[in-house]
Amino acid sequence: MAVTACQGLGFVVSLIGIAGIIAATCMDQWSTQDLYNNPVTAVFNYQGLWRSCVRESSGFTECRGYFTLLGLPAMLQAVRALMIVGIVLGAIGLLVSIFALKCIRIGSMEDSAKANMTLTSGIMFIVSGLCAIAGVSVFANMLVTNFWMSTANMYTGMGGMVQTVQTRYTFGAALFVGWVAGGLTLIGGVMMCIACRGLAPEETNYKAVSYHASGHSVAYKPGGFKASTGFGSNTKNKKIYDGGARTEDEVQSYPSKHDYV
């Protein structure tokens, strides 16, 4: 029972995580205009992996896609790649884990096969989560670097009374969604891997009882298993399951108004 719960919970957590990774990848708010030094702007800029947007205080929003591929920064391309790899791995992991779920019976699939599938999906979820976390972290690092660079150049080009204020960008909502989603996918993957250990057919050691018969050196093993020759051998014997229900003995593992002066 505990294994089923762990597996089910791992699946649900991973599902939420992958949905979050997809949402984060599609979101436009990866970086948002920093308003700390400029709270009075009537034009708000924000950017995503695929397009940049401008929201005017009049309520109109205009978004423009990045229609170039070669002209984009290598880091942005890398983040895109990481997020897409994360989504693809996660999606495949979800597909595999559906068939691996203990509560779903498909033909006469053995528990060993389900265990392998559970482990495979678990590893996929872990890698998917790591890809998302890495992608978001790379983007965040890029923002931090650019933020301090633009701060250093904040008032370059000042001439007389004229100020040219450079737009600075800070962390957008998508980064936090991505971090949380990546973490959930990672946790879900770990849970699937834990569940896999409980699903795998148990390997029990049976101590051999030796009977010394005259002229033979045969070790007899209790439990209906075929006797193996060789005195005192510590052979591991596998139980044979009939595909029926089996009891589990594993421990169960268990979220305006504005005034401008």
Epitope: T41, A42, V43, S58, E62, V162, Q163, V165, Y260
Partner: antibody, heavy 118, light 113 residues
């Protein structure tokens, strides 16, 4: 067509308050911010503030904060501006204007003249 | 607050002539996000409310004659009337649309000789 109809001229005493209105028609009233602009006789234009009738959000020019209060009534498609503690400096023509793409004001009311005199 | 400085304060021209008026802002009105300048031009005829002519520094409002042209970027902007007509007698205001509070220039009064 879009129309902004403002209330008539007001003659008020210093220290008193006045509430002027701007009735909108010909467009989705709740979807556009409404601005208020002040113009003293023979002088330039001064932005007072704006209100979003959809949810009542307001943004004020710090100079007018506390003196001007903007409200909106969706049922009658009307925005109001109340001016309190009036002085002779507040004698002016007040315009309401719809806020559109580009942060520009495309349609304006005909103006309401407020005269503060004892 | 952003200071909008218009020049000249008034000018007198004959019908058919080309007119150019200037507007300077104390801070750049160019938005890096969409490379648009948030500046508008208004025309106010005597006894009337202002009328929007140009927004985004160069986009002509629908219904505005094509003799009115807006240009410029950053802090320096220009309104040009290619061939002045008698009905163009008015005060022309530029307005900062980028930063709160929205501020207007003091205006350029156009008179027809």
């Amino acid at each position: 067509q879009v129309q902004l109809q403002q209330s008539g001229a007001e003659l008020v005493r210093p220290g008193s308050s006045v509430k002027i209105s701007c009735k909108a028609s010909g467009y989705a009233f709740s979807s556009y911010w409404m601005n208020w602009v002040k113009q003293r006789p023979g002088q330039g234009l001064e932005w007072i503030g704006q209100i979003y009738p959809g949810n009542g959000d307001t943004t004020y020019n710090g100079k007018f904060k506390g003196q001007a209060t903007l409200t909106a009534d969706k049922s009658s498609s009307t925005v109001y501006m109340q001016l309190s503690s009036l002085t002779s400096e507040d004698s002016a023509v007040y315009f309401c204007a719809r806020f559109v793409k580009g942060n520009a004001m495309d349609y304006w009311g005909q103006g309401t003249s407020v005269t503060v005199s004892s | 607050d952003i200071v909008m400085t218009q020049s000249p304060s008034s000018l007198s021209v004959s019908a058919g002539e080309k007119v150019t008026m200037s507007c300077k802002s104390s801070q750049s009105l160019l938005n890096s996000g969409n490379q648009k300048n948030y500046l508008a031009w208004y025309q106010q005829k005597p006894g009337q409310p202002p009328k929007l002519l140009i927004y985004g520094a160069s986009t002509r409002e629908s219904g505005v004659p094509d003799r009115f042209t807006g240009s410029g970027s950053g802090t320096d902007f220009t309104l040009t009337i290619s061939s002045v007509r008698a009905e163009d007698l008015a005060v022309y205001y530029c307005q900062n649309d980028h930063y709160y509070p929205f501020t207007f220039g003091s205006g350029t009064k156009l008179e027809i000789k």
